[in-house]
Interface confidence: medium
């Protein structure tokens, strides 16, 4: 069963946000961080196939403005009562008998149920408040240290303008039950009979505290000589205006593709992917496009030697088992984006980083770009998925899941529509069912799965994670063996 919290958020947003303007919160852990007036950065996506993530920077708008004063009050919207229940049951039985001979009978039932009842309300900043706020206050001088760091990385900064929050503490429960029975009798001189039955029940409960943010909306900050707030962010607009000129690195430092100073590795990655093609039209938004993007990225890896691949894989396996190491590696590579030397790290993150830098501490773009892309994909996935990828890496069983995920992405086109696909037994090996690695990998992407006749119900919102899962499997697989 996938994340119960995410499922609830998905249902609430589907119901209350028809304009698609709200950004769903992806984990309960981060749900308290998104409050009106809070500043967030949009972590650029390493691919066109999954969405950027928003991350709190633990600052409020008042922290970057002077004179210092509390933020203006927010408006509380009316409450919505949200009730979502799901109850499904499948059962079947079979009996085989020949007159006066053996009898075999069996039955099975699977049921799934969940119910959620909650009150949700909105908190928003009145659009007119921004005008007043910016008229009465101006950017603090000297600039806040965090803003300086974000400026040097070229990150875009946003302010939360509206949130959807829970009114009371809510308990969300999902139950999954399986039952099976069988009996047989063999008539003869001595009659032999037997029967057996069993059941398995799985229950997942999550408590969402009162005041948890389920989804939020943002406006973009533009910082030039003073601050401006764009309530309708423009894709081309940047928070910090880039410096007029950027120096190029000398080739001996390994500058391919060359990175102008102040440009992030992520933007360099996009230039590398599009190779001069306008960003939107770089790859078609379907499985062929995703595969082409992944192949473009992994092309460089095919030339790397065995020793380096081994070092990289060992480090990546460690990073997949350690969320803190994953974050540390991401931060270190972000630091290297602005072309400064990268600080060495300990543990598995350090092992990966060591492969990506020259003796000067500068990143080698040919190596850093595929790893930044891979980390971008990995950050879309859950901790459970990371652990399963580490296990598949260790046991060299990446190809099976790669083919399965690829096949589903290909079959599910167009991704914007719900559909049901049956799974070819050849792709499942001998393990399918709750708890099987392939099942968990897909379940964690937010797909509805069927066990008795293996099938998958495609959910449009699973696209980002599924594409990221495919990219992660493909790159790890490419590093660990000969490309197919």
């Amino acid at each position: 069963m996938g994340s119960a919290f995410e499922r609830v958020v998905r249902r609430v947003v589907q119901e209350l946000d028809h304009g698609g303007e709200f950004i769903p919160v992806t984990s309960l852990q981060s749900s308290t961080g998104f409050q009106p007036y809070c500043l967030v950065v949009r972590k650029p996506s390493s691919s066109w196939f999954w969405k950027p993530r928003y991350k709190c920077v633990n600052l409020s708008i008042k922290d970057i403005l002077e004179p210092d004063a509390a933020e203006p009050d927010v408006q509380r919207g009316r409450s919505f009562h949200f009730y979502d229940a799901m109850d499904g049951q499948i059962q079947g039985s079979v009996e085989l008998a020949a007159p006066g001979q053996a009898k075999i009978a069996g039955g099975a039932a699977v049921s799934d149920s969940s119910s959620t009842s909650m009150n949700v309300y909105s908190l928003s900043v009145d659009p007119n408040t921004w005008q007043t706020l910016l008229h009465e206050r101006h950017l603090r001088q000297p600039e806040h240290k965090v803003l300086q760091q974000l400026r040097s990385r070229g990150d875009n900064v946003y302010v939360v303008t509206e949130v959807l929050q829970t009114q009371k503490e809510v308990e969300v429960t999902r139950t999954h039950k399986r039952e099976g029975s069988g009996r047989f009798s063999l008539p003869g001189a001595t009659c032999l009979q037997g029967e057996g039955q069993g059941h398995l029940s799985q229950k997942k409960t999550v408590t969402i505290p009162s005041g948890s943010t389920l989804a939020f909306r943002v406006a973009q900050l533009v910082i030039d000589s003073d601050l401006d707030v764009l309530l309708f962010p423009d894709k081309k607009q940047r928070t910090f205006q880039p410096p007029a000129t950027g120096h190029k690195r000398s080739t001996s430092e390994g500058a391919w593709p060359q990175l102008p100073s102040g440009l992030s590795m992520m933007r360099c990655l996009h230039n590398f992917l599009t190779d001069g093609v306008p960003a939107e039209g770089a790859f078609t938004e379907d499985f062929q496009g995703l595969r082409a993007e992944v192949e473009t990225i992994s092309k460089e890896l095919e030339l790397l030697d065995r020793e380096l691949c081994q070092l990289l894989l060992e480090g990546l396996e460690g990073v997949l088992r350690d969320q803190l190491a994953l974050r540390a590696l991401e931060e270190a590579l972000e630091q290297g984006q602005s072309l400064g030397p990268v600080e060495p790290l300990d543990g598995p993150a350090g092992a990966v980083l060591e492969c990506l830098v020259l003796s000067s501490g500068m990143l080698v773009p040919e190596l850093a770009i595929p790893v930044v892309y891979l980390l971008g994909a990995l950050t879309m996935l859950s901790e459970t998925q990371h652990k399963l990828l580490a296990e598949a890496l260790e046991s060299q069983t990446l190809l099976g899941p790669l083919e399965l995920v690829g096949s589903l992405l290909e079959q599910s086109a167009p991704w914007q529509e719900r559909s049901t696909m049956s799974l070819p037994p050849g792709l499942l090996g001998n393990s399918w069912g709750e708890g099987a690695p392939a099942w968990v990998l897909l379940d964690e992407c937010g797909l509805e799965l069927g066990e008795d006749t293996p099938h998958v119900c495609w959910e449009p919102q699973a696209q980002g994670r599924m594409c990221a899962l495919y990219a992660s499997l493909a790159l790890l697989s490419g590093l660990s063996q000969e490309p197919h």
Epitope: L303, L304, D305, L308, C355, V364, E366, L367, E482
Partner: nanobody, 130 residues
Framework: QVQLVETGGGLVQPGGSLRLSCAAS????????MGWFRQAPGKEREGVSC?????????YYADSVKGRFTISRDNAKNTVYLQMNNLKPEDTAVYYC??????????????????????WGQGTQVTVSS
């Protein structure tokens, strides 16, 4: 713009020496295994020697050049060299350098197979004649 440029070729008498250089621009040479290949008129391209990236310590040579040729690299200069001593007329060919991959096998000869290479230079002519 990824480029490999070979220099140092020329006309030399049998028994003489030449030092070929392969300079890389637009990418970081030291993360790649590098190889030297040659193609004589009317013959197929063949592997001469290769050297592993900074992550390894291996050097391989074709039997025909063992003991006479030495491959080396200077990562700071983004350059790979081929020192050729005791040259013979059968060494006459256009010499190319290229990035090579032998990560998928422990067979030492695989790096000398042109098909596993990636980036290629435009070549430099070596003529051994009296």
């Amino acid at each position: 713009q990824v480029q490999l440029v070979e220099t140092g070729g020329g006309l030399v008498q049998p028994g003489g020496s030449l030092r070929l250089s392969c300079a890389a621009s637009g990418f970081t040479l030291d993360i790649y295994n590098m190889g030297w290949f040659r193609q004589a008129p009317g013959k197929e391209r063949e592997g001469v020697s290769c050297i592993s990236s900074r992550y390894g310590t291996s050097t391989y040579y074709a039997d025909s050049v063992k003991g006479r040729f030495t491959i080396s690299r200077d990562n700071a200069k983004n350059t790979v060299y081929l020192q050729m001593n005791n040259l013979k007329p059968e060494d006459t060919a256009v010499y190319y350098c290229a990035t090579v991959s032998w990560r998928f096998t422990t067979n030492q000869d695989v790096c000398l197979t042109p098909s596993v290479s990636g980036y290629w230079g435009q070549g430099t002519q070596v003529t051994v004649s009296s």
